[in-house]
Interface confidence: medium
């Protein structure tokens, strides 16, 4: 083979092998979620997880997220707060 | 080296180099989230973000998502609406 | 070219080609979300999706997630339950 056609062949092979490795790796990425429930008006996600939603006791649907990790239920006298926590899982 | 064993060596090298690049790239992927709050009964996520949950004023827990980007709080006379917005961050 | 400099050239080419393939693949990863609404107090996400948040009828903001796939609204006499369901989309 000439160097030129060899270069083409190597390029093709890289595309093939790397492509299939990438496809397998990307396909295995998932979204891993868990719930954390705490007494009172605050619930904090584990390190490395992001808050995607919050739930509150007493039917309360008003909440905010503090420091990107903690659910805060805004209704008075909250008995419990829950955080829905997710992360990308390779 | 024969062309055949050279091909094998190249394949192995592709697996190694591509594998390490892929591992690095996949390992750095994270979930980035932010909150958007608006007056009224609608709150829209920035471009590129997906709605993962909504929150509403007046303790309201009833909402729906419009056009995959906007939180809509369903209770009457909503003073504010919040959207929890997330995206995969390379 | 010597085998040594050829090896270096191949390594460089793998880095280049695989690197750009990986960048494109990673850049195209997104968060795909959808809503599922059901009558009653339970709503289940499709296979492969994770629950990121829940919504309930009657303004109820109290919910929990069962088996990581199902939203359960906790207020009495729920007329409907909604699940916000997301997955990483290559």
């Amino acid at each position: 083979k000439t160097l030129c056609s060899m270069e083409e062949a190597i390029n093709e092979r890289i595309q093939e092998v790397a492509g299939s490795l990438i496809f397998r790796a990307i396909s295995s990425i998932g979204l891993e979620c868990q719930s954390v429930t705490s007494r009172g008006d605050l619930a904090t996600c584990p390190r490395g997880f992001a808050v995607t939603g919050c739930t509150c006791g007493s039917a309360c649907g008003s909440w905010d997220v503090r420091a990107e990790t903690t659910c805060h239920c805004q209704c008075a006298g909250m008995d419990w707060t829950g955080a829905r926590c997710c992360r990308v899982q390779p | 080296k024969t062309l055949c064993s050279m091909e094998e060596a190249i394949n192995e090298r592709i697996q190694e180099v591509a594998g390490s690049l892929i591992f690095r790239a996949i390992s750095s992927i994270g979930l980035e989230c932010q909150s958007v709050t608006s007056r009224g009964d609608l709150a829209t996520c920035p471009r590129g973000f997906a709605v993962t949950g909504c929150t509403c004023g007046s303790a309201c827990g009833s909402w729906d998502v419009r056009a995959e980007t906007t939180c809509h709080c369903q209770c009457a006379g909503m003073d504010w609406t919040g959207a929890r917005c997330c995206r995969v961050q390379p | 070219k010597t085998l040594c400099s050829m090896e270096e050239a191949i390594n460089e080419r793998i880095q280049e080609v695989a690197g750009s393939l990986i960048f494109r693949a990673i850049s195209s990863i997104g968060l795909e979300c959808q809503s599922v609404t059901s009558r009653g107090d339970l709503a289940t996400c499709p296979r492969g999706f994770a629950v990121t948040g829940c919504t309930c009828g009657s303004a109820c903001g109290s919910w929990d997630v069962r088996a990581e796939t199902t939203c359960h609204c906790q207020c009495a006499g729920m007329d409907w339950t909604g699940a916000r369901c997301c997955r990483v989309q290559p």
Partner: antibody, heavy 116, light 107 residues
Framework: EVQLLESGGGLVQPGGSLRLSCAAS????????MSWVRQAPGKGLEWVSS????????NYADSVKGRFTISRDNSKNTLYLQMNSLRAEDTAVYYC?????????WGQGTLVTVSS | DIQMTQSPSSLSASVGDRVTITCRAS??????LNWYQQKPGKAPKLLIY???YLQSGVPSRFSGSGSGTDFTLTISSLQPEDFATYYC?????????FGQGTKVEIK
Amino acid sequence: EVQLLESGGGLVQPGGSLRLSCAASGFTFSSYAMSWVRQAPGKGLEWVSSISASGTSTNYADSVKGRFTISRDNSKNTLYLQMNSLRAEDTAVYYCAKSNSDFDYWGQGTLVTVSS
Amino acid sequence: DIQMTQSPSSLSASVGDRVTITCRASQSISSYLNWYQQKPGKAPKLLIYGASYLQSGVPSRFSGSGSGTDFTLTISSLQPEDFATYYCQQSGYDPATFGQGTKVEIK
């Protein structure tokens, strides 16, 4: 060539404050998470804090949570660590490191001594 | 937090020796295991990431293996510049945690 240069270390009394800086060059700073790792004299390595590329997400070791604040200025290619309520056990060499998973590049370190 | 346990804590070896250091995680961390070399007064240097991937510029006498909870760093033929302290670190779960270190000394 990737370079990370820490500054701001020194001697401080217990309860005092210090602000460490890390000037980065040789890579696209705004595209990478960054971390602080410390090493007490004669001891092993301890992760302290990390911050995402955009600065929206931060993580802290339990031993420093509520006392230390990590931040970054992507326009200046600089990472910061604000350390308040310092204790004797915070005495260490503080390294800034690129990434928040495998730390592929490290600065030379800056010594923080907490003593009365 | 995940505990990382290295063994041995120190070892004596000669130039040319094959050296093996092990690291055990308190729970499975898949392949999220990194190895660093540190010389006195210097910053650590990444040798291996992802359990087995050689960091750019690191000599091929260094290799890593393992997955799950048990990992190994091998130096196939010890060189004078390899006498240092070696740390493993897991990056599978926050917070990142390091092993206590293994000091490789001249026999």
